[in-house]
């Protein structure tokens, strides 16, 4: 009997008004629902305009809920990133400060006349750590070549050493091992330590970036219809007290977030790789031990050069010929006392252990973020019915929800009864983010094995100018050619959200 159906729309008025919409749209009593496009077409308290407004609102509310969940995860990753980044930078800055404080006394002019070379080394290490596309081994080789040239000139001020003689010295250097074992040891340890540190921090950056970009992926029109039906059609159909059935909600959100769930496998791989690489933070080649002790390798190298000076000079003369002597020049530099070495092993401060255990726990907590998202949003944001009973809203009426819950991911939505999902059309933004996760995981795996990978970012078009090896100048044979015409700019995923902090050092 139509008259008995014609109930008051007071409750709907209240809910609709509370959402900020004009009450003039709301009928006083139920009307026939043939005009409804989304909700079942029974008697209703919703006009076409109301249905459209509520559909838009439900869409916006889901996107907000999705962004809120993402923001919490992003904030956690950003906090982790900043903590680790601060710690690693602090280790390197500490080492440089120690060098600046102790080397003048220990080495005198052998340091002060070469302060710029040491400053440059630390700057390059900082840039490398921050994700610049430069080759660490080349950078170190270049530093030792510069230093040898300058120190050799300083130790022999009485000799005439033109560029061609210095070029010859540079070519002999590898065989002569003028700095003893320090360069080799530093190269092996620093490569492993810096690669581990920077790839871990970059991993946090990539993870955060992926979450941010995925949160911006718009929900499609089919999802909007399904969410409207889930959230507000009960109001329109006069059962505003009926809460959505849990399985019904899950099916809607699994359909809506099908593409997001496809991130799961690569997301887990990334987090696993990040947890794994923290193993490389300990021991004699560990991050804390190496990054904080760069200066001790440098001191060892200068001491070795001074100790080997006579043998080295004899070998250089043997390989490069007798240099001319400056008749007005001073005698050879007096042998300085050995620079006092701080112990090479830094006692662990405990800070890194604390950071790592916190990070591991938090990364484990968010491993299933993408596949648990539908369940999380349903239980936290959708005011679900507490049980799958006959009293919950099943999308048509108050009653039991019978369809089974779909699996996770796009392919499993083929028969989703609530959201029409075209499984042949994956979202391209999400596919790109899956690729970013894969790339970063590969970097971390390479880093775990101590290998520096080409950190050219996948999203980079690879363009850029530079003069490549281009050492066309006849005086630069000494230079270690920089294989990449690297622009030394930190990459997209170097450290998202952190400023580059290229210190302007002034005299």
């Amino acid at each position: 009997d139509p008259a008995s159906k014609s109930r008051s729309c007071g409750e709907v008025r209240q809910i609709y008004g509370a959402k900020g919409f004009s009450l003039s749209d709301v009928p006083q009593a139920e009307i026939s629902g043939e005009h409804l496009r989304i909700c079942p077409q029974g008697y209703t308290c919703c006009t076409s305009e109301m249905e459209e407004n509520l559909a838009n609102r439900s869409h916006a509310e889901l996107e907000t809920a999705l962004r809120d969940s993402s923001r919490v995860l992003q904030a956690m990753l950003a906090t982790q990133l900043r903590s680790f980044d601060d710690h690693f930078q602090h280790l390197l800055n500490d080492s440089e400060r120690t060098l600046q404080a102790t080397f003048p006394g220990a080495f005198g002019e052998l340091y002060t006349q070469n302060a710029r070379a040491f400053r440059d080394l630390y700057s390059e290490l900082r840039l490398y750590y921050r994700g610049a596309n430069l080759h660490l081994e080349e950078t170190l080789a270049e530093f030792w070549a510069r230093l040898l040239e300058r120190l050799f000139k300083q130790l022999h001020p009485q000799l005439l050493l033109p560029d061609d003689y210095l070029d010859c010295l540079g070519k002999q250097a590898e065989a002569l091992r003028p700095f003893g074992e320090a360069p080799r040891e530093l190269r092996l340890r620093a490569t492993r330590a810096f690669v581990a540190a920077r790839s871990f921090v970059q991993g946090l950056g990539v993870a955060s970036d992926v979450v941010r970009k995925v949160a911006q992926v718009p929900l499609g029109p089919e999802c909007s219809r399904a969410v409207m039906k889930l959230v507000y059609c009960a109001h329109c159909l006069g059962v505003p007290g009926a809460r959505p059935c849990p399985d019904y909600c899950r099916n809607v959100l699994k359909g809506c977030l099908a593409n997001q769930a496809d991130l799961d496998a690569e997301w887990r791989n990334l987090l696993d790789s990040m947890v794994l690489i923290t193993d490389k933070f300990w021991g004699t080649s560990g991050v804390e031990s190496v990054i904080g002790s760069v200066h001790t390798w440098l001191a060892e190298a200068i001491n070795a050069l001074q100790d080997n000076r006579d043998t080295l000079t004899a070998k250089v003369i043997q390989g490069c010929g007798n240099p001319k002597v400056n008749p007005q020049g001073p005698g050879p530099e007096e042998k300085r006392r050995r620079g006092k070495l701080a112990p090479r092993e830094r006692p662990p401060s405990g800070t890194l252990e604390k950071l790592v255990s916190e990070a591991k726990a938090q990364l484990r907590d968010v491993q299933d973020f993408w596949i648990s998202l539908p369940g999380t949003l349903c239980s936290e944001k959708m005011a679900l019915s507490t049980a799958s009973d006959d009293r919950c809203w099943n999308g048509m009426a108050r009653g039991r929800y019978l369809p089974e819950v779909m699996g996770d991911g796009l392919a499993n939505q083929i028969n989703n009864p609530e959201v029409e999902v075209d499984i042949t059309k994956p979202d391209m933004t999400i596919r790109q983010q899956i690729m970013q996760l894969k790339i970063m995981t590969n970097r971390l795996r390479s880093a775990y094995n101590g290998n520096d990978v080409d950190f050219q970012d996948a999203s980079d078009d690879g363009s850029g100018s530079g003069s490549g090896d281009g050492c066309l100048d006849d005086l630069c044979s000494r230079k270690v050619s920089r294989k990449s015409s690297s622009s030394r700019t930190p990459l997209t995923h170097a450290l998202p959200g952190l400023s580059e902090q290229e210190g302007q050092k002034t005299s």
């Epitope: 006349q113 710029r116 070379a117 400053r119 440059d120 700057s123 390059e124 900082r126 840039l127 430069l134 510069r146 040239e149 300058r150 000139k153 300083q154 001020p157 005439l160 050493l161 033109p162 560029d163 210095l166 400056n326 020049g329 001073p330 530079g466 003069s467 490549g468 090896d469 281009g470 050492c471 066309l472 100048d473 005086l475 630069c476 000494r478 230079k479 050619s481 920089r482 015409s485 690297s486 030394r488 290229e502 210190g503 302007q504 050092k505 002034t506 005299s507």
Partner: antibody, heavy 119, light 107 residues
Amino acid sequence: QVQLVQSGAEVKKPGASVKVSCKASGYTFTGYYMHWVRQAPGQGLEWMGEINPSTGDTTYNQKFKARVTMTRDTSTSTVYMELSSLRSEDTAVYYCAREKRDDGVFAYWGQGTLVTVSS
Amino acid sequence: AIRMTQSPSSLSASVGDRVTITCRASRSISTYLHWYQQKAGKAPKLLIYSAYNLQSGVPSRFSGSGSGTDFTLTISSLQPEDFATYYCQQSYSTPYTFGQGTKVEIK
């Protein structure tokens, strides 16, 4: 061969700023320090500062420290020198010069940029 | 800052003459001393680096000597193209500094 090509002459009013560019070619840009040296009309040479194109680190002559900024753009192999709060005494030819090797020796020079400061 | 003093400020000489220019540093700079030649309206050109090394492409009539605080640039036989201003420069410490220049004119 190594070439340093500077931007054209500038006329500025006192108090203004000037930004001179120096585009490098013929070598690995990030491999050598670049310096700026100026020469007032009929005067000698005066070193203003240096920049490491690889890291962006700079060292300035104390005399100019408050007014000079040196930057680089590695994608175009260009260094820049900006001098602010110009006064008439800043009228000079400004040269960029590349080190020979890591030694503070200026083996390659730009053609110079005349900056005239006049009201 | 290290002060560099050149002498003489100017000199007149004839083609074929032997010319000597001196440069004194206000403190010892080892051999971190370099010589440049500059012609009117042109950029300076490196002649000698590290006190005594001849830059590639520079004629062998130019030579340098000295160490510590006193340095000399010698042109063994002055040529017409050598009439120019000559500057010394130290790279021992920043700020790098130049001498005030020595102008070599035709007698």
